[in-house]
């Protein structure tokens, strides 16, 4: 190797200056006694190199780039060799930003997968490899005192969510949870959440059905629908409140919300609808009165209201 570049820092804040030095060894016999060292950033030649011979006979060129405005570029030092440029050495320069504080950290407890799923917004692009780690600990109180640490949760590349498995959770006990972002320019941490996994539980929705007509029950009135639903069995013992939404299948009507439904009701007569009209209906539930997240809306049930009973008065048409 005839030449060697060293830089003040290979990774800097975008727009910051960078200083580099290129040293050419004396024993490079094919070189001129006083070679002129050239600098190139990417494909562009860079003026301003200050060259000197050192006491050991080596040549050194120092350059200061006042603003590194490329997020990634190669800086090379070279010599004119015949009609071509002979590259002596090159280094990769990176520029970007330290990670912003991750924000909007939120979690939900999925009882089916038995895991606490947390997600966050990473903030603006840093232009640098940035790692995110979901960090947590168990706490007996309100997270002021830290108990056992929980194994770090590292999301897959590019993802802004991570799942803490059941074996690291303690239900009905608070956990401190935060996200740490780190790159070559710094580290930042989100505000800490303090939560009991059960306080962010997200239930699965019930399954809506049409109510089986029983011989003794009166048929639904015009503009009414008789509904029943099967609760999500694994959440059966969790007190919850539910709500329905419905809209006519045809037309551009928006959803109409009905709720909260009577607690523990597993059936409901929905009235005030248009007669002889097909409706789409869905139901969702939330742990209540204790805190939790709304379930997703259930798969749709499609039902038709009965016709209005025929009336016997006459319509007179006036011409």
């Amino acid at each position: 190797e005839c030449g060697h570049i060293s830089v003040s820092a290979p990774i800097v804040h975008l727009g910051d200056p960078i200083t580099a030095s290129c040293i050419i060894k004396q024993n490079c016999s094919h070189l001129d006694p006083e070679p002129q060292i050239l600098w190139r950033l990417g494909a562009e030649l860079q003026p301003g190199g200050r060259q000197q011979r050192l006491s050991d006979g080596t040549q050194e060129s120092i350059i200061t780039l006042p603003h590194l405005n490329h997020t990634q570029a190669f800086l090379s030092c070279a010599l004119n060799w015949g009609n071509s440029l002979q590259i002596l050495d090159q280094v990769e320069l990176r520029a970007g930003y330290p990670p912003a504080i991750p924000h909007n950290l939120s979690c939900l407890m999925n009882l089916t997968t038995s895991s606490l799923i947390c997600q966050w917004e990473p903030g603006p692009e840093t232009h640098l490899p940035t790692s995110f780690t979901l960090k947590s600990f168990k706490s007996r109180g309100n997270c002021q005192t830290q108990g056992d640490s929980i194994l770090d949760c590292v999301p897959k590349d590019g993802q802004s969510h991570c799942s803490i498995p059941r074996k690291h959770l303690l239900l009905y006990q608070n956990m401190g949870i935060w996200v740490q972002a780190e790159n070559a320019l710094g580290t930042s941490m989100s505000p800490q959440l303090c939560l009991d996994p059960m306080a962010v539980v997200k239930l699965e929705p019930p399954m809506l059905r049409t109510m089986d007509p029983s011989p003794e029950a009166a048929p639904p009135q015009a503009g009414c629908l008789q509904l029943s639903w099967e609760p999500w069995q694994p959440g059966l013992h969790i007190n919850q409140k539910c709500e329905l939404r419905h809209k006519p299948q045809r037309g551009e009507a928006s959803w109409a919300l009905v709720g909260p439904l009577p607690l523990e009701a597993l059936q409901y007569e929905l009235c005030g609808l248009l007669p002889a009209t097909a409706y789409t209906l869905q139901i969702r539930c939330i742990r209540w009165p204790l805190p939790g997240h709304w379930s997703d809306w259930s798969p749709s049930l499609e039902l038709r209201t009965t016709e209005r009973a025929p009336t016997h008065h006459h319509h007179h048409h006036h011409h």
Epitope: L111, T112, S114, P234, H237, N239, L263, E264
Partner: antibody, heavy 118, light 107 residues
Framework: EVQLLESGGGLVQPGGSLRLSCAAS????????MGWVRQAPGKGLEWVSS????????PYADSVKGRFTISRDNSKNTLYLQMNSLRAEDTAVYYC???????????WGQGTLVTVSS | DIQMTQSPSSLSASVGDRVTITCRAS??????LNWYQQKPGKAPKLLIY???NLQNGVPSRFSGSGSGTDFTLTISSLQPEDFATYYC?????????FGGGTKVEIK
């Protein structure tokens, strides 16, 4: 301290009836599911029935369906099990228990013995 | 109905032994598995809920693991007061069902 105290057990003839009670204290009774679990002499545990916090949902074991009725009086903090058409195989210690949100039983009462015999 | 099969039905062990009891569900029950200890003439006592959560006041030598269909209760170092019968129970769906029990006796 959470306490559950069963009463009403005793000797009854086949075909007879009995009503068990469970008095609860030390927690907000009206917020919790409650249940009955029985244990025949020298045997394992068998779930009998549960009741939701307001009493609207009452699942039963097939072995007692149509014969037993679970109910509760939240104003008296009391759980009941009305047992009709009793059979010899209903002989057991009957425990009342508070149900956790994910379906575990804790705590349990001390149990009351029901003996069905002629 | 979901059947719960416990094994072994009984075992003999000495104080200080590591004891493992298994419970298998006839279908997947996620983590809805609870463990109880019962001593003669006494009501059962909850040890572990939701497969691995230690109930308050239960010694840390008790631990639970598993998910889906296969679950384990482990006593890391058996103490004299641990000789009892242990039951698993699924709470994934009604009817709620118990395993047949495992009696832990002194060797």
């Amino acid at each position: 301290e959470v306490q559950l105290l069963e009463s009403g057990g005793g000797l009854v003839q086949p075909g007879g009836s009995l009503r068990l009670s469970c008095a609860a204290s030390g927690f907000t009774f009206s917020l919790y599911w409650m249940g009955w679990v029985r244990q025949a002499p020298g045997k394992g545990l068998e779930w009998v029935s549960s009741i939701s916090s307001s009493g609207g949902v009452t699942p039963y074991a097939d072995s007692v369906k149509g014969r037993f009725t679970i109910s509760r009086d939240n104003s008296k903090n009391t759980l009941y099990l009305q047992m009709n058409s009793l059979r010899a195989e209903d002989t057991a210690v009957y425990y009342c228990a508070k149900l956790g949100e994910l379906g575990w039983f804790d705590p349990w009462g001390q149990g009351t013995l029901v003996t069905v015999s002629s | 109905d979901i059947q719960m099969t416990q094994s072994p039905s009984s075992l003999s062990a000495s104080v200080g032994d590591r004891v493992t009891i298994t419970c298998r569900a006839s279908q997947g029950i996620s983590s809805y598995l609870n463990w109880y200890q019962q001593k003669p003439g006494k009501a059962p006592k909850l040890l572990i809920y939701y497969a691995s959560n230690l109930q308050n006041g239960v010694p840390s030598r008790f631990s639970g693991s598993g998910s889906g269909t296969d679950f384990t209760l482990t006593i890391s170092s058996l103490q004299p007061e641990d000789f009892a019968t242990y039951y698993c129970q699924q709470s994934y769906s009604t009817p709620l069902t118990f395993g047949g029990g495992t009696k832990v006796e002194i060797k």
